[in-house]
Interface confidence: low
């Protein structure tokens, strides 16, 4: 990743330093571990999404826990705190991306194997919308490779 040189980038760096992204890391790690423990069902099926197309998504509390989280109050608390932290980045797409990249980098050593890494990455990509926030238009979540992340 290129180092930012703009004033806006320095503003983002100070935002990142102030932010506590640990609850996001804890929420995601618990989520993928729970998914692994469940009965082999597809953890990405749309029926398990915190928003349902039949609801008016703009009226829903963006911090309400996803159906997964009702099984673990701790995780629900992590998600709410995580969303509160990510909310600080919504008006700056580049900064939201930096925050997500930081989460990915912080957890990369704890992820066991390519499959778990891909799962973590998918959940991380979903995180902004689970919080009712806008996903960054471009964001490379690869930790070691220089190329852009593509499915």
């Amino acid at each position: 990743r290129q180092q930012w040189e703009l004033q806006g980038d320095r503003r983002c760096q100070s935002q990142l330093e102030r932010a506590n992204l640990r609850p996001c890391e804890q929420h995601l790690m618990q989520k993928i571990q729970r998914d692994e423990d469940s009965y082999g069902r597809d953890p990405y099926s749309p029926s398990q999404d915190p928003y349902s197309p039949s609801q008016d998504p703009d009226r829903r509390d963006p911090y309400s826990p996803s159906p997964y989280d009702r099984r673990g109050a701790g995780s629900s608390q992590h998600q709410e705190r995580c969303c509160n932290e990510l909310n600080e980045f919504e008006n700056n797409q580049r900064c939201m991306c930096e925050a997500l990249q930081q989460i990915m980098e912080n957890q990369s050593d704890r992820l066991q194997g390519r499959q778990q890494e891909q799962q973590f990455k998918r959940e991380l990509r979903n995180l902004p919308q689970q919080c009712g926030l806008r996903a960054p238009q471009r964001c490379d979540l690869e930790v070691e490779s220089g190329g852009r992340d593509r499915y």
């Epitope: 999404d49 928003y51 197309p53 703009d58 998918r122 992340d149 499915y151």
Partner: antibody
């Protein structure tokens, strides 16, 4: 290779509802993190970004269209759709669907819809 | 909404020429800018993203620069296949907005 293809009636009468569907091939529309967008281009004019829908049904609409626009998603058909109510001649345009977020924005080739009696 | 002012609206040039198109935002968009190429009847294609990064597979004669509010797109050494319409798009804020487009024609 992911491809998007728009389909809809070429002609819509004023005051009626315009409907366009975008079929996605080469990727599941349920993949999280992407948003599926609609953009239009009036004849000889610039582009207007109309809004998006996430795979989970969450939407954002351009405030200039908010009272008339609705987007929906059909995961079983791997399609997403646009409806625009109370159309006038000013809604005559090429309608493009697109996939945005996380990587290269990917557009369909567009479909021209004319509003005329 | 963020207004994107693109100029010129049309441009005549010859094969081998160097051409430059500019896009100006009415507020800071950092580097959240795409440059697209569009040919009638085809899907618009991203050439440059994040204001200056070359999209995979795009020839190096295309380049972009700028940050904040002023952005430039350059084609060095025009090729016959480059005659098309080019437009910028900001994705820093919702709703995303576009420049009016520049039609590049053969002189």
């Amino acid at each position: 290779q992911v491809q998007l293809q728009e389909a809809g009636p070429r002609l819509v009468k004023p005051s009626q509802t315009l409907s366009v569907t975008c079929t996605v091939s080469g990727a599941s529309i349920t993949i999280g993190g992407y948003y599926w967008s609609w953009i239009r281009q009036h004849p000889g004019k610039g582009l207007e970004w109309m809004g998006y829908i996430y795979s989970n049904g969450r939407t954002y609409y351009n405030p200039s269209l908010k009272s008339r626009i609705a987007m929906s998603i059909d995961t079983s058909k791997n399609q997403f759709s646009l409806k625009l109510t109370s159309v006038t001649a000013a809604d005559t345009a090429i309608y493009f669907c697109a996939r945005e977020a996380w990587e290269t924005p990917l557009w369909g080739q567009g479909t021209l819809i004319t509003v005329s009696s | 909404d963020i207004q994107m002012t693109q100029s010129p609206s049309s441009l005549s040039a010859s094969v081998g020429d160097r051409v430059t198109i500019t896009c100006q935002a009415n507020q800071d968009i950092v580097n959240s800018l795409n440059w697209f190429q569009h040919k009638p009847g085809t899907a618009p294609k991203v050439l440059i993203y994040d204001a200056s990064k070359l999209e995979t597979g795009v020839p190096s004669r295309f380049s972009g620069s700028g940050s904040g509010t002023h952005f430039t797109f350059t084609i060095s050494g025009l090729q016959p296949e480059d005659f098309a319409t080019y437009f910028c798009q900001q994705y820093e804020n919702l709703p995303h907005t576009f420049g009016q487009g520049t039609k590049l024609e053969i002189r």
